[in-house]
């Protein structure tokens, strides 16, 4: 697995460059964490043709997975920034169950689904850090999360590999707009 | 052809123990997941336990009626599934069928063993 | 879990009508456009035998007079044209989710 960002040799070898800002940290683990999906999506194209299914099928879907939305304001176009920052943190709180239960559903990437299972985690906190509203922020039930966990693995083969490619899109895809946000930020 | 053969079923008396096999042929035995599943005229059919192979890692479940009594087991270099049984009750008189859940949800069984707890 | 309420419990069809079996589950058992309702048939002294996999896909060998339909949480099998050889057990079953769960039941006669 990739050295998660701020382990790198090279930050040891040139003690001399200025630190990260706050928002370049942000900025390199959120890419951090994309390198690591591709790797993931790559291991899930590999396996089945999930990779393969329309736009209509994963659409047909009962997972509740978060989504950027007008009213978060986090596109160009009504951009808030305060309700942003809270609608990418609570999006990613929601995320972590999902990312739990890709931790064994991988072979050859295992360790890899662990680094951006825990590096999902130093982010929320880079992220809560920056906010000024925490109160805004609302955390997951623990019981539901439990009860959801289980129902997903208990799914059969087919819809497991389907659950996981669609986290995997949607996870990628709500990074990539929390990216573009914060560097609005 | 996809094919199964239980054995081990009998006469057992409430309490005792018993071991059912169920050896697979016709299809990558290793790569699906497999069940036992029970019938009687009491409760109709009724799944029993599965034992899933999923990234190298085994995940096992059982129905609620067989938790803690029953256990699940594979051997896949013998294409074979087990079911051990202990503490049997007359409520767990049945025909018991190996089948293989298939990735599409199409399931396969075996003809059956059958299973008579009684004093 | 689960639940799945097949109906009737028992039918009597004359030779070469249509026979229409329900089955309405408890919750959808379909997700990404796909629904993991299988439909079997069994004679006595034999295991089940799969007609019907994913609604409607019918198990191989299995003559086209049987066909599935529905989706969500409400399914049939069709039986047209009724055939002497039709007169057995039918089950639906669930393969959404751990515990796998089956319906009651409908035996299926000869009018």
């Known amino acids: 697995a990739p050295v998660p960002p701020g382990e790198d040799s090279k930050d040891v070898a040139a003690p001399h460059r200025q630190p990260l800002t706050s928002s370049e940290r942000i900025d390199k683990q959120i890419r951090y964490i994309l390198d690591g999906i591709s790797a993931l999506r790559k291991e899930t194209c590999n396996k089945s043709n999930m990779c393969e299914s329309s736009k209509e099928a994963l659409a047909e879907n009962n997972l509740n997975l978060p989504k950027m939305a007008e009213k978060d304001g986090c596109f160009q176009s009504g951009f808030n920034e305060e309700t942003c920052l809270v609608k990418i943190i609570t999006g990613l709180l929601e995320f972590e169950v999902y990312l739990e239960y890709l931790q064994n559903r991988f072979e050859s990437s295992e360790e890899q689904a662990r680094a951006v299972q825990m590096s999902t985690k130093v982010l929320i906190q880079f992220l809560q850090k920056k906010a000024k509203n925490l109160d805004a922020i609302t955390t997951p039930d623990p019981t539901t999360n439990a009860s959801l966990l289980t129902k997903l693995q208990a799914q059969n083969q087919w819809l497991q590999d389907m659950t996981t490619h669609l986290i995997l899109r949607s996870f990628k895809e709500f990074l990539q707009s929390s990216l573009r946000a914060l560097r609005q930020m | 052809e996809v094919k199964f053969e239980e054995s081990g079923g009998g006469l057992v008396q409430p309490g005792g123990s018993m071991k059912l096999s169920c050896v697979a042929s016709?299809?990558?035995?290793?790569?699906?997941?497999m069940n036992w599943v029970r019938q009687s005229p009491e409760k109709g059919l009724e799944w029993v336990a599965e034992?899933?192979?999923?990234?190298?890692?085994?995940?096992?479940y059982y129905a609620e009626s067989v938790k803690g009594r029953f256990t699940i087991s594979r051997d896949d270099s013998k294409s074979s599934v087990y079911l051990q049984m202990n503490n049997l009750r007359a409520e767990d008189t049945g025909i018991y069928y190996c089948?293989?859940?298939?990735?599409?949800?199409?399931?396969?069984w075996g003809q059956g063993t059958l299973v008579t707890v009684s004093s | 879990d689960i639940v799945l309420t097949q109906s009737p419990a028992s039918l009597a069809v004359s030779l070469g009508q249509r026979a229409t079996i329900s089955c309405r589950a408890s919750?959808?058992?379909?997700?990404?456009?796909?629904?993991?309702m299988n439909w079997f048939q069994q004679k006595p002294g034999q295991p089940p035998k799969l007609l019907i996999y994913?609604?409607?896909n019918q198990g191989s060998g299995v003559p086209a007079r049987f066909s599935g339909s529905g989706s969500g949480t409400d399914f049939s099998l069709n039986i047209h044209p009724m055939e002497e050889d039709d007169s057995a057990m039918y089950f639906c079953q669930q393969s959404k989710e751990i515990p796998w769960t089956f319906g009651g039941g409908t035996k299926l006669e000869i009018k």
């Open positions: 016709g299809f990558s035995f290793s790569n699906y997941w």
């Open positions: 089948a293989s859940l298939f990735y599409d949800g199409y399931l396969h």
């Open positions: 919750e959808s058992v379909g997700n990404f456009g796909i629904s993991f």
């Open positions: 994913t609604a409607s």
């Open positions: 034992i899933r192979l999923t990234s190298n890692k085994q995940a096992i």
